[in-house]
Amino acid sequence: APISSHCRLDKSNFQQPYITNRTFMLAKEASLADNNTDVRLIGEKLFHGVSMSERCYLMKQVLNFTLEEVLFPQSDRFQPYMQEVVPFLARLSNRLSTCHIEGDDLHIQRNVQKLKDTVKKLGESGEIKAIGELDLLFMSLRNACI
């Protein structure tokens, strides 16, 4: 398996009650606006064929996509949560900027691409779904990177 380096976040990033609560509140509010309950973005299949030790790198890719293609374009919605959560997630992304995999990451890119394609195919409702799954993104980042 490829070796991942610098793919680590300090536990303290996920032990801040206020921002954790705001992230979950944002997810809950967006999920109420999500009428497509059949599709799941962050679930078992995202990790298909990806070893546990590679998953922080995978989640880094998902986080960066979510920030750039979902949260920034939708930044005027779901206030006041959005204006607090986006900078927090951007800080996590910055801390993972040196997280890389030595070797082939094609299997990871394939899984991330499926998530991207699903969001793009669903259009705005895909973006709302991604925001509605920020709780799952948060928990998966915590599990994968601490």
């Epitope: 398996a1 962050i42 679930g43 078992e44 299949k45 990790f47 298909h48 070893s51 546990m52 030790s53 928990m139 998966s140 599990n143 994968a144």
Partner: antibody
Framework: EVQLQESGPGLVQPSQTLSPTCTVS????????VHWVRQHSGKSLEWMGR???????SYNSAFTSRLSITRDTSKSQVFLKMNSLQTEDTGTYYC??????????????WGPGTTVTVSS | DIVMTQTPSNLAASPGESVSINCKAS??????LAWYQQKPGKANKLLIY???TLQSGTPSRFSGSGSSTDFTLTIRNLEPEDFGLYYC?????????FGSGTKLEIK
């Protein structure tokens, strides 16, 4: 309460097919993966394969050619089918549920197992 | 496949004592090791995963440590119900593989 229960014939003839059933309750097969693990008597555990929540499957390459895992979500059942049985396939067969969607390789809940003897 | 070497095979101890069981992986598995307890007539029980995370319901006298290739399960202040078989399992990658087991008996 999460529960898994294996069932199947205790005795199978050599060269025949083994087909235990895992019946689950307390969770949905469309939300969690179910794995099959076997244990030769008094020996270690051996992971055989997995039924993903979306119906896909993964197998241990040691069994791939003779192993098949299917399910019936309406009956909350997962089926193992292994053909060309030999006496060394004698043992206890377990089904187990993954912890959650992230810790999908962690076997959090197990059935009591079904004992299979391969003998003529 | 990753080979898990578990030691010792047998262990005898008295209630109140502390014991340690070791597991070594043939290649690095980061922190992704689980420990299970097996007792006759009972379903196998997940005790610890990710090396040191206690599964819900696991008593605090159980602890896991280690990373990369070397891991340890420690049981402090042994209770009568702790005696049985213990297995380690790497849950980093497929195929999932288990150690050969440690039989913990009452001295």
């Amino acid at each position: 309460e999460v529960q898994l229960q294996e069932s199947g014939p205790g005795l199978v003839q050599p060269s025949q097919t083994l087909s235990p059933t895992c019946t689950v309750s307390g969770f949905s097969l469309t939300s969690y993966s179910v794995h099959w693990v076997r244990q030769h008597s008094g020996k270690s555990l051996e992971w055989m394969g997995r039924m993903w929540s979306d119906g896909d499957t993964s197998y241990n390459s040691a069994f791939t050619s003779r192993l098949s895992i299917t399910r019936d979500t309406s009956k909350s059942q997962v089926f193992l089918k292994m053909n060309s049985l030999q006496t060394e396939d004698t043992g206890t067969y377990y089904c187990a549920r993954s912890l959650d969607f992230y810790y999908d390789t962690t076997l959090a809940f197990w059935g009591p197992g079904t004992t299979v003897t391969v003998s003529s | 496949d990753i080979v898990m070497t578990q030691t010792p095979s047998n262990l005898a101890a008295s209630p109140g004592e502390s014991v340690s069981i070791n597991c070594k992986a043939s290649k690095t598995i980061s922190k992704y090791l689980a420990w299970y307890q097996q007792k006759p007539g009972k379903a196998n029980k997940l005790l610890i995963y990710s090396g040191s995370t206690l599964q819900s319901g696991t008593p605090s006298r159980f602890s896991g440590s280690g990373s990369s290739t070397d891991f340890t399960l420690t049981i402090r202040n042994l209770e009568p119900e702790d005696f049985g078989l213990y297995y380690c399992q790497q849950h980093n990658e497929y195929p999932l593989t288990f150690g050969s087991g440690t039989k913990l008996e009452i001295k």
